[in-house]
Every structure is written in structure tokens, then in C-alpha cells.
């Protein structure tokens, strides 16, 4: 294993005129650790403010975690010659707040990208597609990890965060080959209609620990390869017939529904019937009612139709506060 020589500057990496030169095939950037045998470069927890320009051409796995990158511009990893071997890129926890269009262009082998734990106030619609064409060249990405990328409220720039992420996922239909998508812990209240239809190859989808309140227009019908669907720790009250039928129609899927505030009233009857006969829900015996109060902590599988009633709504004049 080689690491940056002691004569290298200890300041965060800054591009210089020399960076226009092609990198030596085996050199290691300042503040990074490199292993040619493992095809791995780690520039971890070094407060880097830019992506090193002199990355070795052999790099297959690049860890740039725990830095202070702030902005990822177009062509942030574009090199001459290109980093043709780079397959896994981890940028988690690097204080990124802006990922611009074309940030990952000229990485022909990039299979896995992790942007988790960055407060992305701006994610360009063309971050993953690279161009604003209605149909872009397919992205090589197979795994895209976007857990906890929601910015604090004061950085949201008055736009829908759900919409911003969805736009990047569907732009140019570039991510049709994506197998894994993690979107956990992003405060999502909804998914824009048809976003999943643009990701037909998905095998693993993690939407856990969000605030999803309805799946009425989330269509899983096209996701015929889906194997794992994580919906734990959301705000789901009930799943309706259309959703139940779509999930049942997926040949390989396992669905995780724990820790949602299920409302056990008359609207829940179809879901309870479905739960009793389906094999797709993992840990279905753990699902319990949250509302109404009289049903709290009752196990959904143990309910029958007589338990699931809707109290008549009193006219306002008869209601008490």
C-alpha cells in the first residue's frame, strides 16, 4: 500500500496548473491512501474541498467520505485519459449541498454511487443522466444510494425535495438499468406519479424511515424484478386494493411494512384479508394498529371484519371538543 508522500502539502487538495497533466499511473494524491493491488483509493475524513485531480488510473473503488466538498461540478471526475475503471464511488458525509448536471460524466464503468448523508439543497435533474436530452445515453449505474440526503428546512429553496430527487431519477430515462435504489430517511411525504415506472430493473428499493402517507399513485406494476421493498417507519395508514394487487402480482417481492401507524377501521378490511393470505409481507405478524385508540396495539392478522368498523361521524353541532 502506498500513501501520499511526506513532502506533499498537508492543506486540502487544490487544483493547480499542473493538474492539466495526465496523472502518473501509480501516483497517490495528497491526503489519500492508495492500494493498487486492491484498486482502491481512500481520501477519508481529510476535509478535502475538491475532488483530487491526480487520481490514479487504476482506481476502481474511490472513497471520498467525510470531507467538505460542498459542490460537485459538471465533470468533477472527468480526466484525460478517463477513469475508465472506476466502478464504486462513495461520497457519503462530505457536506455536499449541490450536485450539478453531468457531475458523474466520463465514468464509463461507474456501477455504485453513494451520496448518503449529504444535505443536498440542489440535485440537478441531470446529475445522473449527464444531459438534458429527453432520452440520454444509459447510465452504467446499478446501485444508487441516497439515504439521508434531505437538507435542513432552511436550505430547501422553497422547492419540493421529493420532486427534485424524482426529476434526477427519471431524467432522460438514463437509470433504466438501476438494480438498487436507497432513499431512506429523507422525510419524503410522497413519490411523484410514475417515478418508479422509469426504473424497471429495480430489484431492491428502500423507502424506509420517510413520512410516506399514501401509496395511491405509487405504481409497482412495472417492477417485475423487484425482490425487496422497504416501507418500514413511514406514515402509512392503510394499503388499498390497487396497491395490494400490484404487490401480489410481483413474482419475487418481499415487502417490509413494520412501524407504520395503521388505522384499523372499516377501510382496513381489505388489507387485513390480504395479509392473512399473502406470503409477500415479511414479519406480517408484527404489524399492529395505531388507531383508533380502542384498537391500539392489536395485531392486524388477528382482526376480523367485526373489529373493523367506522364510527359514524356526528354532525358538528353534536360533537364535543
Amino acid at each position: 500500500t502506498s500513501s501520499a508522500s511526506s513532502s506533499s502539502s498537508s492543506a486540502p487538495f487544490l487544483a493547480s496548473a499542473a493538474s492539466a497533466q495526465p496523472p502518473l499511473p501509480d501516483q497517490c494524491p495528497a491526503l489519500c491512501e492508495c492500494s493498487e493491488a486492491a484498486r482502491t483509493v481512500k481520501c477519508v475524513n481529510r476535509n478535502l474541498t475538491e475532488v483530487p485531480t491526480d487520481l490514479p488510473l487504476y482506481v476502481r473503488n474511490l472513497f471520498l467520505t467525510g470531507n467538505q466538498l460542498a459542490v460537485l461540478p459538471a465533470g468533477a471526475f472527468a480526466r484525460r485519459p478517463p477513469l475508465a475503471e472506476l466502478a464504486a464511488l462513495n461520497l457519503s458525509g462530505s457536506r455536499l449541498d449541490e450536485v450539478r448536471g453531468g457531475a458523474f460524466e466520463h465514468l464509463p464503468s461507474l456501477r455504485q454511487l453513494d451520496l448518503s448523508h449529504n444535505p443536498l439543497a440542489y440535485l440537478s435533474p441531470f446529475a445522473f443522466s449527464g444531459s438534458n436530452a429527453s432520452i440520454s445515453a444509459p447510465s452504467p449505474l446499478v446501485e444508487l444510494i441516497l439515504n439521508h440526503i434531505v437538507p435542513p428546512d432552511d436550505k430547501r429553496q422553497n422547492r419540493s425535495f421529493e420532486g427534485m430527487v424524482a426529476a434526477a431519477l427519471v431524467a432522460g430515462r438514463a437509470l433504466q438499468g438501476l438494480h438498487l435504489l436507497e432513499l431512506a430517511s429523507n422525510h419524503f411525504l410522497y413519490l411523484p406519479r410514475d417515478v418508479l415506472a422509469q426504473l424497471p430493473s429495480l430489484r431492491y428499493l428502500d423507502l424506509s424511515n420517510n413520512s410516506l402517507v399514501s401509496l395511491t399513485y405509487v405504481s409497482f406494476r412495472n417492477l417485475t424484478h423487484l425482490e425487496s421493498l422497504h416501507l418500514e417507519d413511514n406514515a402509512l395508514k392503510v394499503l388499498h386494493n390497487g396497491t395490494l394487487a400490484e404487490l401480489q402480482g410481483l413474482p419475487h417481492v418481499r415487502v417490509f411494512l413494520d412501524n407504520n401507524p395503521w388505522v384499523c377501521d372499516c377501510h382496513m378490511a381489505d388489507m387485513v384479508t390480504w395479509l392473512k393470505q399473502t406470503g409477500v409481507v415479511q414479519g406480517k405478524d408484527r404489524l399492529t394498529c395505531a388507531f383508533p385508540e380502542k384498537m391500539r396495539n392489536r395485531v392486524l392478522l388477528e382482526l376480523n371484519s367485526a373489529d373493523l368498523d367506522c364510527d359514524p361521524i356526528l354532525p358538528p353541532s353534536l360533537q364535543t371538543s
Epitope: 435533474p125 429527453s134 419540493s160 421529493e162 420532486g163 424524482a166 426529476a167 427519471v170 431524467a171 430515462r173 411525504l189 410522497y190 413519490l191 411523484p192 406519479r193 410514475d194 417515478v195 422509469q198 402517507v213 399514501s214 395511491t216 399513485y217 405509487v218 395508514k237 392503510v238 388499498h240 377501510h267
Partner: antibody, heavy 118, light 107 residues
Amino acid sequence: QVQLQQSGPELVKPGASVKISCKASGYTFTAYYVNWVKQSHGKSLEWIGDINPNNGGTNYNQKFKGKATLTVDMSSSTAYMELRSLTSEDSAVYYCAKEGPPGAMDYWGQGTSVTVSS
Amino acid sequence: SIVLTQTPKFLLVSAGDRVPITCKASQSVSNNVAWYQQKPGQSPKLLIYYASNPYTGVPDRFTGSGYGTDFTFTITTVQAEDLAVYFCQQVYSSPFTFGGGTKLEMK
């Protein structure tokens, strides 16, 4: 910022057709459905239908099937609604609206007034 | 199609009032209800979606609640600029339908 710019007012004769445009800017056009809504003078809102700009797929209110045709031009990020066989009942303001949360419309055009009169 | 019955049609209010508007669906629409505000000569503006979630930038005096068939939209402290027509909309099944509207006017 997100904007939906609709074409100007139309005065047309009964039996004629009219095509209203809605040019979108400030967002990824193909990522969101475009809805069309009718508002007759002093009345409520009526949903005409929606179109998925990504593939041109449409969903119409049965009441407007045969009356309205929705199309998009992805290259110009523009949605269109054609109304045909117009009668005085079709006199109204027509809005295009971008969908945000499914079904809900978070940005609206300024409206296009269509007056059918001989 | 699902019918939404919105009441009342008109409301005379004073600044500072708490104003509830109700919307009743002819069948269950789960929590798939949106509320809009339309000021004279303007396009509608989305205030609430999924029954209770305020849209980005909407003042917190506008709130929504309900599930199934019965929904309430409330302005907790009416201000002069809130004078408008308010519409509910169900987005549960096509065709999406709107309530008849509630017009807010100052006493």
C-alpha cells in the same frame, strides 16, 4: 422558478376547434404530469384530464372524451389541449397545471379564456 | 365519479376568526384530498395535500384534517389577504373531482 405560460384568449365560432398551449419552464418537464382544468364563469373547477410528458400517455375525464385532446411536445416542453366542436357550453377559462404530489396541482398557468360566440 | 360536497358555500368572517370548511366525499377517498385557494382574477394555489400536509411555503394558519369521507380545512386566524374561494379536490380516483367552493368574505 417554475412557470407555466399559456397562450392568449380565444374568440371562436360554434363548431370550430381551438388549440391551447402551455409552455413549461423551471423544472424537468418529463418528470411530472400536466393536468388540464376547466372553470366556467363563476363556477367550480372541472378536471379535464392529464398527460404524462414522458410517454404521452393520457387519462381523460369521461365527460371530456371526444371534446378534448391532450398532447405534448417534449422538445419545447410544451403541453397542448385541443377542443373541438365548440359550443357555448365550452366558454370558460382553461388552466394547465403541473402535478406535484400525485393528483394535486402545485403550479398553475395563468389560464386561457375561450369564448364561443357566433 | 366521486362527488365532493363542500360546506358552507359562503362565509362572512372577521379578521382573527377561526374558520372551518368541510368537504364530504360520496365514498372513501382515504387521505387523498387537496385544498386550493383562488383569489379573484388569479389561478388556484395549492395549500394542502394528502388531507393534512401543508404545501411548501404555505403559512401555518392553514391546516387540514380528515380521512375516508369527511375532511376539514381550517384557517386558524383569518387575515384580510385570505379572502378568496377555497376548493377541495379528491385525487383518489379518476376523474379527479372538486368541491363546489367556499367563498370567504369580510363582514
